[in-house]
């Protein structure tokens, strides 16, 4: 009868190299009595006997992996135990060898000139594949701008137009070579103006051609702006050749203007824009054409807010460095003066002053202030504020300064246009229209009969405006 014998592994496990989808076998020869139980582990995890990916034969001494996968890499151990002495173990590694495989191939890229481009090329393989790149038909050479990263991706700093082309990556190890598909790198270039339009000084009624040339990728579009708005007249001719667009704007000149050429192209969701401007001036302007002294805009001050028509345009006088602030300061000072006048006079005077300092404005090539109608000015002077006006006019020859209206920037009524001559040439005061029904009930406020009737006209719906462009007493 045989004597019991503890297990001894007579052929220790060795490192096994295997290709993916091939068979790999570990041999664990054991001598012992009685016959041992042999178990197998991979990375310390027990391999189950019924796992169909493995075949365990020869009483457990032979482990076969039927179709190797890259995830089978690891340390395999066999353990033999027959109850006599201790269990014994031997371990060996499985190294899965793999031909190169490109797991994340490059894709087509559009990139803006000057940016950084990265073309991916992630690979698998054992031994680890080396990655190189081909541009067109030639191997790509690395330089200070172009580098193949550890990951295999191609990085191009400060992309230039000449970097555009077809690229593919090549993964290579001792078992083989893999090639990616060809991909396209397109380099987009911001719109840039090559030739700006030139300024012209011409006579009235001349024809002028402004020329603007731009380059970019994609080819830019060119638009023209006249004094901040889209060009309303004139003909435009365009010619495109080799990424360059040439635009010519022909104009019939009846007024001076600032003409801007805007070149735009699109990069994905973003746009790039380049601009160049030229002035067209008219050699002989008449004096009257030069006389616009301001601009039209919304009144956004406080003092006249309740007096001026909502949302109306008023005239700002550019003889002041900051017209809006200067005129507001004037009215603010005037308003304080009005605290001293009678309740009859005050609202009428407020309406007069606000509509005189902030006159209704007609926008256009030459913004024009619309003065108060003479009749309304006289109504304030001779009816609503007769006492105050007399005091104010008398101050100069009496040498007296008394509270009332003597500091106020009031208009000289006689110099204002009459609404009977042209109702559209002057501004009405709605406050007075509203009050005219009650004028007969007002106490007598002057010794002589007033020289003016409150005008019997519908209240104006026009807006009131801003500009001390008229003489003030």
């Amino acid at each position: 009868e045989k004597l019991p014998k503890a297990p001894v592994i007579t052929t220790p496990l060795e490192t096994v190299d295997a290709l993916v989808e091939e068979v790999a076998t570990f041999m664990c020869a054991v001598e012992s009595y009685p016959q041992p139980e042999i178990s197998w582990t991979r990375n310390k995890i027990l391999i189950k006997l019924f796992d169909t990916r493995y075949s365990i034969r020869e009483n457990g001494q032979l482990l076969t992996i039927l179709s190797v996968e890259d995830s089978d890499d690891g340390i395999y151990c066999c353990t033999a135990n027959n109850g006599v002495g201790g269990a014994v173990e031997s371990c060996g590694a499985l190294q899965v060898k793999m031909k190169p495989k490109i797991t994340r191939p490059p894709i087509n890229v559009k990139i803006i000139e000057g940016l950084k481009a990265v073309l991916p090329c992630t690979t698998m393989g054992n031994p680890k594949p080396s990655v190189s790149w081909i541009k067109g038909d030639s191997a790509l050479r690395e330089n200070s701008r172009i580098a193949v990263l550890e990951s295999g991706s191609l990085r191009i700093h400060n992309v230039q137009k000449e970097d555009a082309g077809q690229y593919r990556c090549v993964a290579k190890n001792s078992l083989g070579t893999a090639y990616s598909k060809l991909v396209k790198l397109e380099v987009e270039v911001f719109a840039r103006i090559l030739r700006a339009p030139e300024s012209h000084n011409v006579t009235f009624g001349s024809f002028v051609t402004l020329r603007c040339t731009a380059i970019g990728m994609p080819v830019p579009t060119i638009s023209w702006i006249e004094n901040g708005n889209a060009v309303s007249s004139g003909s435009i001719q365009e010619n495109v050749k080799d990424r360059v667009i040439d635009s010519r704007l022909q104009l019939f000149i009846t007024k001076p203007g600032l003409y801007t050429c805007i070149a735009t192209n699109k990069h994905g969701e973003k746009f790039s824009t380049a601009k160049a401007a030229a002035t067209v001036s008219i050699a002989e302007w008449s004096k009257s054409q030069k006389e616009s002294k301001g601009y039209c805009a919304q009144y956004r001050g406080e003092v006249c807010d309740a007096v001026l028509v909502k949302d109306s345009l008023v005239f700002f006088n550019t003889s002041y460095p900051d017209p809006e602030e200067a005129q507001e300061l004037l009215i603010h000072t005037a308003w304080n003066e009005l605290k001293a006048v009678s309740p009859l006079c005050r609202p009428a005077a407020e309406a007069l002053l606000c509509n005189h300092l902030f006159q209704e404005c007609s926008p256009g090539v030459l913004p024009t202030p619309m003065p108060i109608c003479r009749e309304y000015c006289l109504a304030v002077k001779e009816l609503f504020c007769a006492k105050e006006w007399l005091a104010m006019e008398g101050k100069t020859h009496r040498g007296l300064y008394r509270s009332g209206m003597h500091f106020l920037p009031v208009p000289e009524c006689s110099k204002l246009p009459s609404m009977h001559q042209d109702p559209t040439a002057c501004t009405r005061l709605p406050y007075l229209d509203y009050k005219k029904e009650n004028i007969t009930t007002f106490p007598s406020i002057t010794s002589s009969k007033p020289s003016v009737d409150i005008p019997n006209l519908p209240a104006s719906t026009s807006s009131f405006a801003v500009s001390p462009a008229y003489s003030m007493t």
Partner: antibody, heavy 121, light 112 residues
Framework: EVQLLESGGGLVQPGGSLRLSCAAS????????MSWVRQAPGKGLEWVSA????????YYKESVKGRFTISRDNSKNTLYLQMNSLRAEDTAVYYC??????????????WGQGTLVTVSS | QTVVTQEPSFSVSPGGTVTLTCGLS?????????PDWYQQTPGQAPRTLIY???SRHSGVPDRFSGSILGNKAALTITGAQADDESDYYC????????????FGGGTKLTVL
């Protein structure tokens, strides 16, 4: 040199109140309109309220009307924003800003560094 | 309710020119909206660049200019520099019903 220094921010529960102050120096305070502008974390600027140099009118963003009150003390060169019934969406950095002139709606030409208001339970 | 629209982002090359715009969801921007432009870098208070359409704030380089282009307000930066990379906000005076001041959502400008 124009200087605007906000204070009074902090953590407050929804429904609570805070009063922000803005101490101004380096200019004639009463000659300029003032505003409060806020900026929620990671968001853009949002105008909240304005007041002219005289303090005679006040203007508010619709969502804060009835809850916020802007005021100024020209003798103390100080702008205030009283915030009541605070909501989580009022959480922001609140900037005090000087207008370019006496009116309430001139350009904002000088800004404080801001004070953080957090409304959270 | 007045909604002011700006491009969310824009990029420009150093030395290049870029025009940022500011529009109204309903209607055109005019000089009566007194468009103002502000620059803000992360963690800083805003800085005024342009006020009332085209007036440059003191100390602002003349590379920055404002205008009305068509139905929008525009801020043009010529000869862009790396430190122009910021958020840009426009502010408009609005007078629909009651006086208001409304900021656009801002444009993130990247100088590449």
């Amino acid at each position: 040199e124009v200087q605007l220094l906000e204070s009074g921010g902090g953590l407050v529960q929804p429904g609570g109140s805070l009063r922000l102050s803005c101490a101004a120096s380096g200019f004639t305070f009463s000659d300029y309109g003032m505003s409060w502008v806020r900026q929620a974390p990671g968001k853009g600027l949002e105008w909240v309220s304005a007041i002219p140099g005289s303090g005679g009118s006040t203007y508010y963003k619709e969502s804060v009307k009835g809850r916020f009150t802007i005021s100024r003390d020209n003798s103390k060169n100080t702008l205030y924003l009283q915030m009541n019934s605070l909501r989580a969406e009022d959480t922001a950095v609140y900037y005090c800003a000087k207008r370019s002139g006496r009116i309430a709606f001139g350009a904002l030409d000088a800004w404080g560094q801001g004070t953080l208001v957090t409304v959270s339970s | 309710q007045t909604v002011v629209t700006q491009e969310p982002s824009f990029s420009v090359s150093p030395g290049g020119t870029v025009t940022l715009t500011c529009g109204l969801s309903s209607g055109s921007v005019t000089s009566s909206n007194y468009p103002d432009w502000y620059q803000q870098t992360p963690g800083q208070a805003p800085r005024t660049l342009i006020y009332s359409t085209d007036s440059r704030h003191s100390g602002v380089p003349d590379r920055f200019s404002g205008s009305i282009l068509g139905n929008k307000a525009a801020l043009t930066i010529t000869g862009a520099q790396a430190d122009d990379e910021s958020d840009y906000y426009c502010g408009l005076y609005s007078y629909s019903g009651s006086k208001n001041y409304v900021f656009g959502g801002g444009t993130k400008l990247t100088v590449l």
